[in-house]
């Protein structure tokens, strides 16, 4: 059989070899495709619902006005010329659809060395057959499960069109001494040969040195965290990491419902503000890092130091973020 590839939605003409150029003709077409249960026979007379899918032209060729996925299969023509010589034509038809240009979505602008980082997700929509996605670093293919590279793939099929959507999520663990501005790209390779790959626009995240865990410092003002009623306590979370991570605050092990900020001000301290405070630094592509906990307590008039073991209620009082 002769292999024929046709683009979905495009017309296709299959020649019936040996058929007379004009009627009368003695020929028949047999089809075994996704539209047929077994072999379907089409004659030059045509007519009926099949004409919208495939019909025999006056010259004996078979014409499909818009090829679809269901038209994949075997097409055979048997023709007899004026002298009674029989000729057979045999075609294996495969269809394809080139997707739109693949895209990298949810791409990271920053990665951290020494830990797994999600670089991004490559998405290709509208291919047939499915094809494959592959990742490249500086134009060279990245091999999954090698040197800190892992890829999670997903293939979905559209329930109506039958076209495929491919997704590929790239995770990398940058090793020491690598390029601080690596160039990642992703390419779609069609499932049928003779079609060139489609490549995404590249992304160039920055790779940062990891932040040592012990570097999240919590500074309390006044020192010691003991304050008279109505006084102010300022908690500052110092993280030398660059770029600055997001800082959230915890009280007695519970996250405070406040927007991220490196400074927490507790003005007009009351009993409800007493407790143990810590800050949590969340670096992009890095696990959260918690500071040491500090105890904030109220010194009652006439007392010298923090009230032993005093932990106030769960109320927040008035909180200010700088």
């Amino acid at each position: 059989a002769q292999n024929i590839t046709a683009r979905i939605g495009e017309p296709l003409v299959l020649k019936c070899k040996g058929a007379p150029k004009k009627p009368p003709q003695r020929l028949e077409w047999k089809l075994n495709t996704g539209r047929t249960e077994a072999w379907k026979v089409l004659s030059p007379q045509g007519g009926g619902p099949w004409d919208s899918v495939a019909r025999v032209l006056p010259n004996g060729s078979l014409f499909l006005p818009a090829v679809g996925i269901q038209d994949e299969g075997i097409f055979r023509c048997q023709a007899m010329n004026r002298n009674g010589k029989e000729t057979k034509s045999n075609y294996r038809v495969r269809v394809y659809q080139i997707p739109g240009k693949p895209e990298i979505v949810d791409s990271a602008s920053e990665l951290t060395a020494g830990v797994p980082n999600k670089v991004g997700t490559c998405v290709s929509e509208g291919s047939y057959p499915a094809g494959t996605l592959s990742w490249h670093l500086d134009g060279k293919p990245l091999v999954p499960n090698e040197k800190g590279v892992s890829v999670k793939e997903q293939t979905r099929r559209h329930p109506e069109t039958g076209l495929f959507t491919l997704q590929s999520e790239l995770m990398v663990t940058p090793a020491r001494g690598g390029d601080p501005r690596p160039t990642f790209s992703c390419s779609f390779s069609p499932g049928l040969p003779r079609h060139r790959a489609l490549r995404t626009a590249p992304i160039q995240p920055r790779v940062w040195e990891p932040v040592p865990l012990e570097e999240v410092q919590l500074v309390v003002e006044p020192e010691g965290g003991a304050v008279a009623p109505g006084g102010t306590v300022t908690l500052t979370c110092e993280v030398p990491a660059q770029p600055s991570p997001q800082i959230h605050w915890m009280k007695d092990g519970v996250p405070l419902p406040l927007p991220p900020s490196p400074v927490l001000i507790l003005p007009e301290i009351g009993p409800q503000d007493q407790g143990t405070y810590s800050c949590v630094a969340t670096h992009s592509s890095h696990g959260p890092q918690e500071s040491r906990a500090v105890s904030i307590s109220i010194i009652e008039p006439g007392e010298e130091g923090p009230t032993a073991g005093s932990v106030g209620g769960s109320g927040l009082g008035t909180l200010a973020l700088a």
């Epitope: 060395a113 001494g177 690598g178 601080p180 920055r206 790779v207 940062w208 040195e209 660059q242």
Partner: antibody, heavy 119, light 106 residues
């Protein structure tokens, strides 16, 4: 103690090629990138190329066609090759360690090797 | 490619005084600038990276500042060993040096 030492031919004839070696001690080139930078007499510094710990390379786009960088991890050596030399390639050539990922920059430099292009 | 314009190209100053050198990038370099001291017969020496972080062993008389496209490098209480040529380097995208500033004594 981190040390980088460049060695080269000193004199190169025009249109010939230049080969320089950087021999490294005090750190491993499997953990750090190494750059080549040059300085023509009386002029400023010009970055040429870098080879990263994994062997990947990044070149100055204007000189890429004439440059080639490679390394031998077992000997702790980095090599620079430059083709089709002209008189304006006369310069002091330095190899430089890259300090790490961001926010670090090039940190330790060799003392340089002088290259004169002349017939 | 990013261009770095360093000024002044030379600077005459007195010992004990303060000097400031500037570098202007052709685009935002996100604070990825380093400053090097270069004395004749030696390789350059890193003094500051990431705009303002002092390399270990560098005295606090040296400082760096800036953001976006504009950056500066200052030396206060100038000492004789500070006489050298200073270069800025942007390393945000590839690597570009400024033209250098030669520091001299009045």
């Amino acid at each position: 103690q981190v040390q980088l030492k460049e060695s080269g031919p000193g004199l190169v004839a025009p249109s010939q090629s230049l080969s320089i070696t950087c021999t490294i001690s005090g750190f491993s080139i499997t953990s750090y990138g190494v750059h080549w930078v040059r300085q023509p007499p009386g002029k400023g510094l010009e970055w040429l190329v870098v080879i990263w710990s994994d062997g990947r390379t990044t070149y100055n786009s204007t000189l890429k066609s004439r440059l080639s960088i490679s390394k031998d991890n077992s000997k702790s050596q980095v090599f620079l090759k430059m083709n089709s030399l002209q008189t304006d390639d006369t310069a002091m050539y330095y190899c430089v360690r890259h300090g790490g990922y961001f926010p670090y920059a090039m940190d330790y430099w060799g003392q340089g090797t002088s290259v004169t292009v002349s017939s | 490619d990013i261009q770095m314009t360093q000024s002044p190209s030379s600077l005459s100053t007195s010992l004990g005084g303060k000097v400031t050198i500037t570098c202007k990038a052709s685009q935002d370099i996100n604070k990825f600038i380093a400053w090097y001291q270069h004395t004749p017969g030696k390789g350059p020496r890193l003094f500051i990276y990431y705009t303002s972080t002092l390399q270990p062993g560098i005295p606090s008389r040296f400082s760096g500042n800036g953001s976006g496209r504009d950056y500066s490098f200052s030396i206060s209480n100038l000492e004789p060993e500070d006489i050298a040529t200073y270069y800025c380097l942007q390393y945000d995208n590839m690597y570009t040096f400024g033209g250098g500033t030669k520091l001299e004594i009045k």
